[in-house]
């Protein structure tokens, strides 16, 4: 047994028949100590006196309101919720499982942006005698806060004969540090009771790998001359991170009728405007993704084909907004190949993605997985790799990234890569590694070297063991690129000469 | 199964015009746009154009405009090319090839060879 | 007009190798690439779109990767059948272009 709230206590019973039950012991509040009796809910009859009662709690009969009384009046209470767990398993009544991305999946959380505010969503069945209540942090063992509202009901929908309901919750990171790469999960925990019925749901994740842009704004045509094209425009959603040249998206724009059926034209960019061919009664729409890591698309914006081109033409914010002069030269060190260095290391983001695309979807986070995450080195708050600290002085953050780089390349020539099950040459993983040296030199200082950072002996016996330690290598090298990626996009735009 | 059977191989005399057939099958032929890609012996692809057999809307790569034709009759689900004004340049292998996305070829045709000499 | 750029032109190699595809294009193009094989005497096939996207009926020893100006297509372990020209095809924009081919052969 243990407290929720005050007053409020969770049994954890093992569930199945003729179950011994839990014996409790309640006390009453209150400094008398005789003439007291007990009763359970709205029932008069009563169950036992003296200042503590002990029951047997077996089953949901036995929860509820237990109230002390001395002479027709009240002293304390005491409410018993009852938690079960059925073959070693807590039960998963109360909420749906959403089955999206994965079975099991009861909380669902999506971000706009890296800002460290993120919304979860779950659903039920239930309509009444229903309460939820939810807290965040980010990690576990040394929990940094998160500040998570009320629980509240966003939508209902009919599913046949049922009525489905969504509750949402609005959470904020406290500290939160959008440019940095993270590496301690958020973990949201989700209470729910239902009468006497207490459950609790938890979910881990990144922001990175819940952002979920909102779709690009201000789509306008402009019909092309002589041409069955029509030069299409957008601009980035005002609530995606700034500046969006560090932040940059990628977009896919697709020319399609109603029907899912139906020809289409589409087409990918980094721009904010793109030619496609339009067709009487089809629309064009537009989506956009985090251009440095694979997080979700967002939902399409749309513009009729038929409707009149508008005469604003043009290509938007142009995804390297930022604007403001070039930047003054980097104080205490020669500036890097800016260009040369963001071409290479938007590869290195495509071939991190491409050397294991399912790394993606795996759940690879498990007992011990901070230990793991925490072996190889990240771009923390404090490194200077955001847009401010870029502009002040870029050489911190280059740094810290050369030792990133020098780090995975050597930990990719490793034993836990070239071991069993063994990786040849030319393989996605051969050229990231090629890639990572390539980088790093490009970075490296003439006559000028960086501390590295050791590799630790992570080096496991088992292939299946090296197959998962390859995974998460790959996975925290996905969110160590996509900043360094972010960075010399920036530098390329805004600090090159 | 979505498929495209082209006409017979034709021998044409420079400045003369030809015409290829593309008929199509196991699909609305409306659903689908086509495409011409040609293939000079032992070079690579060339894209020629598309049309869209719904509304007979083309476009043709700049390299072939005023010289070629494209149209369809929906009636047969037919496709076809007209190139005119052949040089001996022209001698190819002409592919028909239809995708429901625009931009890329997902079904081709057998192919047609014309060869263009004096 | 986007020029495509295949190399090496020829690739020798042995059943079972791994072969490894390059292509390049003369300006940034995202992932509107595609990827097609053709044997001698046949018509070309699709095996990629967008990059790295598989069609279904290709085998799976058949990938593709890159964005922007620079793509592969890897073949992990050359098959018999696998041995033919290999092209790449831009859709970033009209006129749709594409590389010049590479031959695999058996080594």
């Known amino acids: 047994i243990w407290e929720l709230k005050k007053d409020v206590y969770v049994v954890e019973l093992d569930w199945y028949p003729d179950a011994p039950g839990e014996m409790v012991v309640l006390t009453c509040d209150t400094p008398e100590e005789d003439g007291i009796t007990w009763t359970l809910d709205q029932s008069s009859e009563v169950l036992g006196s003296g200042k503590t009662l002990t029951i047997q709690v077996k089953e949901f009969g036995d929860a509820g309101q237990y109230t002390c009384h001395k002479g027709g009046e009240v002293l304390s209470h005491s409410l018993l919720l009852l938690h079960k767990k059925e073959d070693g398993i807590w039960s998963t009544d109360i909420l749906k499982d959403q089955k999206e991305p994965k079975n099991k999946t009861f909380l669902r959380c999506e971000a706009k942006n890296y800002s460290g505010r993120f919304t979860c969503w779950w659903l039920t069945t239930i309509s009444t005698d229903l309460t939820f209540s939810v807290k965040s942090s980010r990690g576990s063992s040394d929990p940094q806060g998160v500040t998570c509202g009320a629980a509240t009901l966003s939508a209902e929908r009919v599913r046949g004969d049922n009525k489905e309901y969504e509750y949402s919750v609005e959470c904020q990171e406290d500290s939160a540090c959008p440019a940095a790469e993270e590496s301690l999960p958020i973990e949201v925990m989700v209470d729910a009771v239902h009468k006497l019925k207490y459950e609790n749901y938890t979910s881990s994740f990144f922001i990175r790998d819940i952002i979920k842009p909102d779709p690009p704004k201000n789509l306008q045509l402009k019909p092309l001359k002589n041409s069955r094209q029509v030069e299409v425009s957008w601009e980035y959603p005002d609530t995606w991170s700034t500046p969006h040249s560090y932040f940059s998206l990628t977009f896919c724009v697709q020319v399609q009728a109603k029907s899912k059926r139906e020809k289409k034209d589409r087409v990918f960019t980094d721009k904010t405007s793109a030619t496609v061919i339009c067709r009487k009664n089809a629309s064009i729409s537009v989506r956009a993704q985090d251009r440095y890591y694979s997080s979700s698309w967002s939902e399409w914006a749309s513009v009729p084909c038929s409707g009149s081109g508008s005469s604003r033409g043009g290509s938007g914010s142009g995804g390297s907004g930022g604007g403001g002069s070039k930047l003054r030269a980097v104080p205490g060190g020669s500036s890097p190949a800016w260009t040369q260095c963001q071409q290479l290391s938007q590869k290195l983001c495509t071939l991190a993605w491409s050397a294991h695309p399912l790394v993606g979807h795996m759940d690879l986070r498990e007992e011990g997985d901070e230990e793991t995450t925490n072996d190889v080195p990240h771009i923390q708050c404090g490194d200077g790799c955001d847009p401010q600290g870029l502009r002040d002085n870029s050489q911190f953050c280059l740094q810290r990234i050369h030792q990133g780089l020098i780090f995975y390349e050597k930990l990719l020539g490793s034993d836990i890569f070239t071991g069993e099950p063994s990786l040849l040459p030319d393989s996605p993983v051969g050229q990231l590694h090629a890639s990572l040296l390539g980088l790093s030199q490009l970075l490296q200082p003439e006559g000028h070297h960086w501390e590295t950072q050791q590799i630790p002996s992570l080096s496991p016996s088992q292939p299946w063991q090296r197959l998962l330690l390859r995974f998460k290598i790959l996975r925290s090298l996905q969110a160590f690129v996509a900043v360094a990626a972010r960075v010399f996009a920036h530098g390329a735009a805004t600090l090159s000469p | 199964q979505v498929q495209l059977v082209q006409s017979g191989a034709e021998v044409k005399k420079p400045g003369a015009s030809v015409k290829v057939s593309c008929k199509a099958s196991?699909?609305?032929?409306?659903?689908?746009?086509l495409h011409w890609v040609r293939q000079a012996p032992g070079q690579g692809l060339e894209w020629m154009g598309w049309i869209d057999p719904e509304n007979g809307d083309t476009e043709y790569a700049p390299k072939f405009q005023g010289r070629v034709t494209m149209t369809t009759d929906t009636s047969t689900s037919t496709a076809y090319m007209e190139l005119r004004s052949l040089r001996s340049d022209d001698t190819a292998v002409y592919y028909c090839?239809?995708?429901?996305?625009?931009?890329?070829?997902?079904?081709w045709g057998q192919g047609t060879m014309v060869t263009v000499s004096s | 007009e986007i020029v495509m750029t295949q190399s090496p032109a020829t690739l020798s190699v042995s059943p079972g190798e791994r072969a490894t595809l390059s292509c390049r294009a003369s300006?940034?193009?995202?992932?509107?690439l595609h990827w097609y094989q053709q044997k001698p005497g046949q018509a070309p096939r699709l095996l990629i779109y967008f990059a790295s996207q598989s069609i279904s009926g290709i085998p799976a020893r058949f990938s593709g990767s890159g964005s922007g100006t620079e793509f592969t297509l890897t073949i992990s372990s050359l098959q018999s059948e696998d041995f033919a020209v290999y092209y790449c095809q831009q859709s970033n924009s009209f006129p749709l272009t594409f590389g010049g081919g590479t031959k695999v052969e058996i080594k």
């Open positions: 196991g699909y609305t032929f409306t659903d689908y746009y």
């Open positions: 300006q940034s193009i995202s992932i509107n």
């Open positions: 090839n239809a995708n429901k996305e625009l931009r890329y070829f997902d079904v």
